[in-house]
């Protein structure tokens, strides 16, 4: 999902602006930010929340607050402060005019401001009910678990919380912050504030059309009776969440956002800190038929975010818009014509789409893995909510072209048993960002924390590229990919899996000065291949193609171009075994691919040679695919052959661990 | 402890109206409406209506429409239940219980009606 | 509504297993998951037993038990004590409403 440094607005008020009236650099450090929403009509100037570095106490967030209020005053200028975060951000929310802006960045232990802007629901109709009853046999749908041991809690409009379908499994909670409605002539009609809540409540937690019939839900009120919120009234509730748990541990807990916005990298910052803190959040991609990434929540990247999908499997239109895509989208599910409680009456059902609902099924299916298995990291349950989906049945035409590569073609379902899945080795695909077309541009792609990088590729619309390479970052293993001179930029792939106990190294072979071609090997004692990359620093890698793919007894090795480095990831991990398997087609073909089998998991995925018509690999599900330029550019000269070289792992150790379970 | 507590038996003629009350404690009020039951002598249980008070709603069963109101008053947690012109068949025990569920009952109210 | 069809009685003694059906519609028992038995000594207000279909509430002996089929839900008591001698109703949801069954007397021998 979106990399921290998103595609929004940033406004580095380090020189003079003529538009908010600003002067000189902070004096000490480095330079605050200002960031604002890059959806104009989302704006809400004169709110702004001001974030302090990481390790600011409350106290100091509270002297800070005063002293802007202090040299406000002095210039004559009014505030207000509206809330001191802390719990979960250091920071505070004050009311104040953008005059100000320049002079808050200037105070001691800023990090960034965001100026305030507005959330949404995500679903239609807003007001346009259909009354139905539930339209199946209720024993049709009977889960194993209900999702008994954990809480959802759902930041949404007001509920109708003693609705029979929804009575005694919601509490709503004294949390309420909501702008205040637009237009003079809006009249509050209850059954209208409270739709969207009740209806998510229902399909996350409903008697008889909820999906996790035994969760407990919490209500928080962020959404008006419009629908709308504030992404400062969200992060309060979130902050609120965060002090709950704290107040009280409970079991595990799901949050269901249900709303969104343009990029925040507030409210990004503040959901991976609840992440981080064990907290599961849920939410909606979207409804505005773009790419997530331009959102938020939903380009948070440890949020789960969920598209929507029809009972056909395909992506939700909404009126002239639909579902949000790309690579900020975990996964799809149900969000058309979802039966649900309707406020509307007390025994009333009502059909509603859009990511809003699409979300609320993927919080219900996590509170059922997180009741059977309470002890589930975040890293683990996406791994198995990824695992368990219906693979490669969405009709891609839908997204635009460009999109088509990085939307997961995966639809939620339920495991067929809760228990069980332990034995997997659980491996995901995650793509960057775009690099961008500059020369020297690179684009990088993570893991989520307690995810281990097994491998490493790139790919390039144009096929102008110069490979990529794993390096360590943070501590951490990244993903690198490197644009070429004309290029249009490159996006890096990471093979993100869940490897206890596991011990990974890159080993690196320099370019080979013989023509044998470049090749690295995973020379230590118990350690197996999982992954191949390549770079290269010419910008085009001639049709040099080794002469032996891969020495017989030696399958831990990668074998390359002789003008590129190659880098080969070698693990160690208990009953950790790997294998290579090949694909290569003699005919030049614009996608080669090679599967795993069944008990194997794709863990490295890349192409032989590297040559520059080679667009790139990447992996899809258990899949590895190579894709080349047009067959009609390149013609069948011998350069048009390609083989899609997948390393396939499993771990005999988690198989084993899984059977004493049993 | 989650406790419903009625209000004490009545006597009345045909023609008359009687109003009975449920007193709520021990939970969260607006988390579940109120549900009243009836049970004449030797009968079965009857469900009369629903009533919620967290914004007054009601659901009535198809039989009592026109002749029964059902409200509430959050600020004292007490339900209510009427019922216009009373029948003798209108005799009965009636009992509140929580919300649709009701998987908590009050100790019910005994309605005689007799000339 | 009409009500649900419950026997009018059934008997066992003491140790045995007896089952009370509930037969309704798919418009009610049928199509809900909402059906829950009530127990309901001479004298007393009725006491949940059993919701949506084969829950316990807490307090209530394992030896009750629910299940359903189709448009019919049973109520299962294992090993019979004096104490169960009650009458048991059934009830379930209906699209807009609530119905009760006619109600089953259990005799303990």
């Known amino acids: 999902q979106e990399d921290e440094d998103g595609d929004y607005e940033e406004l580095v008020l380090a020189l003079r602006s003529e538009e908010d009236g600003l002067a000189e650099a902070p004096e000490h450090g480095t330079t605050a930010t200002f960031h604002r929403c890059a959806k104009d009509p989302w704006r809400l100037p004169g709110t702004y929340v001001v974030v302090l570095k990481e390790e600011t106490h409350l106290s100091q967030s509270e002297r800070t607050a005063r002293r802007l209020q202090a040299q406000a005053a002095r210039r004559g200028y009014l505030t207000k402060i509206l809330h001191v975060f802390h719990g979960l951000l250091p920071g505070f929310l004050v009311k104040m005019s953008g005059d100000l802006l320049e002079l808050a960045l200037k105070l001691p232990h800023v990090d960034y401001i965001e100026e305030d802007s507005s959330v949404f629901a995500q679903s239609i109709p807003w007001n346009l009910e259909r009354i139905t009853p539930p339209r199946y046999r209720a024993d049709e749908y009977q889960p194993p678990d209900g999702g008994s041991l954990v809480e959802v809690y759902l930041l949404d409009t007001s509920i109708q919380s003693d609705h029979r379908e929804i009575e005694g499994r919601v509490m709503v909670t004294d949390f309420e912050n909501v702008p205040e409605e637009d237009g003079t002539r809006f009249h509050r009609q209850a059954s209208k504030c409270d739709s969207h809540g009740t209806h998510l409540a229902g399909v996350v937690s409903g008697r008889d059309a909820g999906v996790a019939k035994g969760a407990s839900m919490r209500s928080l009120r962020v959404l008006n009776c419009q629908g709308k919120g504030t992404v400062s009234g969200t992060l309060i509730g979130l902050e609120f969440i965060r002090k709950s748990q704290l107040v009280q541990p409970v079991g595990p807990l799901v949050v269901l956002l249900p709303l969104a916005g343009g990029y925040s990298r507030v409210l990004n910052a503040a959901c991976q800190r609840l992440a981080r803190a064990g907290v599961v959040l849920v939410t909606a991609a979207g409804n505005f038929r773009d790419d997530a990434c331009l959102y938020s929540p939903a380009s948070a990247p440890e949020v789960i975010t969920v598209g929507a999908t029809n009972a056909q499997d395909q992506p939700v239109t909404l009126g002239t818009l639909g579902t949000n895509f790309g690579r900020c989208v975990d996964l799809f599910a149900p969000g058309e014509d979802i039966i649900g409680a309707s406020s509307d009456c007390s025994t009333c059902f009502v059909s509603q789409s859009g990511t809003s609902q699409a979300a609320a099924h993927v919080a219900g299916i996590a509170a059922m893995m997180l009741s059977a298995e309470p002890e589930l990291t975040l890293a683990e349950l996406r791994q198995r909510l990824i695992h368990f989906s219906a693979k490669d049945v969405i009709n891609e035409a839908w997204f635009p072209e460009d999109q088509r590569v990085l939307t997961p073609n995966l639809v939620a379902a339920l495991p067929p048993s809760t228990h069980g899945a332990g034995w997997q080795l659980f491996c995901r695909t995650v793509w960057s960002a775009h690099s961008g077309p500059t020369r020297m541009a690179t684009a990088v792609a993570r893991c989520a924390p307690d995810e281990e990088l097994l491998s490493c590729s790139s790919f390039s619309r144009s096929g102008k590229r110069r490979g990529e390479r794993m390096e360590a970052q943070g501590g951490k293993l990244v993903c690198r990919a490197h644009n070429a001179f004309g290029g249009e930029g490159v996006y890096a792939i990471a093979r993100c899996c869940l490897l206890p106990q596991a011990n990974c190294s890159v080993h690196t072979a320099p370019p080979a000065e013989a023509s044998m071609g470049t090749r690295v090997h995973c020379h230590q004692q118990g350690h197996v291949l999982t992954g191949c990359s390549s770079h290269w620093e010419v910008e085009d890698l001639g049709t040099h193609k080794p002469p032996v793919l891969r020495p017989r007894g030696q399958p831990n090795q990668c074998v390359g171009h002789r003008e590129a480095s190659i880098h080969a990831s070698c693990c160690h991990a208990p009953g950790l075994e790997c294998k290579v398997k090949e694909h290569g087609i003699p005919a030049p073909q614009e996608q080669v691919t090679v599967a795993c089998e069944e008990g194997w998991t794709l863990t490295g995925c890349s192409a032989l040679p590297g040559t520059s018509h080679v667009l790139g690999a990447y992996a899809v599900d258990n899949t590895c695919v190579v894709r080349s330029r047009d067959v009609s550019t390149t013609g069948s000269t011998s350069e048009g052959a390609v083989t899609a070289v997948a390393i396939c792992c499993r771990s005999r150790h988690l198989a084993q661990a899984s059977q004493e379970l049993q | 402890q989650v406790q419903l507590v009625q209000s004490g038996a009545e006597v009345k003629k045909p023609g008359a109206s009687v109003k009975v009350s449920c007193k709520a404690s021990?939970?969260?009020?607006?988390?579940?409406?109120i549900s009243w039951v009836r049970q004449a002598p030797g009968q079965g249980l009857e469900w009369m209506g629903w009533?919620?008070?967290?914004?007054?709603?009601?659901n009535y069963a198809q039989k009592l429409q026109g002749r029964g109101t059902m409200t509430t008053d959050p600020s004292t947690s007490t339900a209510y239940m009427e019922l216009r012109s009373l029948r003798s068949d209108d005799t009965a025990v009636y009992y509140c219980?929580?919300?649709?569920?009701?998987?908590?009952w009050g100790q019910g109210t005994t309605v005689t009606v007799s000339s | 509504q009409s009500a649900l069809t419950q026997p009018a009685s059934v008997s066992g003694s003491p140790g045995q297993s007896i089952t009370i059906s509930c037969t309704g519609t798919?418009?009610?028992?049928?199509?809900?998951?909402?059906v829950s038995w009530y127990q309901q000594h001479p004298g007393k207000a009725p006491k949940l037993m059993i919701y949506?279909?084969?829950n316990r509430p807490s307090g209530v002996s394992n030896r009750f038990s629910g299940s359903k089929s189709g448009n019919t839900a049973s109520l299962t008591i294992s090993g019979l004590q004096a104490e169960d001698e009650a009458d048991y109703y059934c009830?379930?949801?209906?699209?807009?409403?609530?119905?009760f069954g006619g109600g089953t007397k259990l005799t303990v021998l």
């Open positions: 219980a929580r919300g649709y569920g009701m998987d908590v």
């Open positions: 949506e279909v084969s």
């Open positions: 009830n379930s949801y209906t699209s807009t409403s609530m119905v």
């Open positions: 009533v919620s008070f967290y914004n007054g709603n009601t």
């Open positions: 798919s418009s009610d028992v049928g199509g809900y998951n909402s």
């Open positions: 021990g939970y969260t009020l607006t988390s579940y409406g």
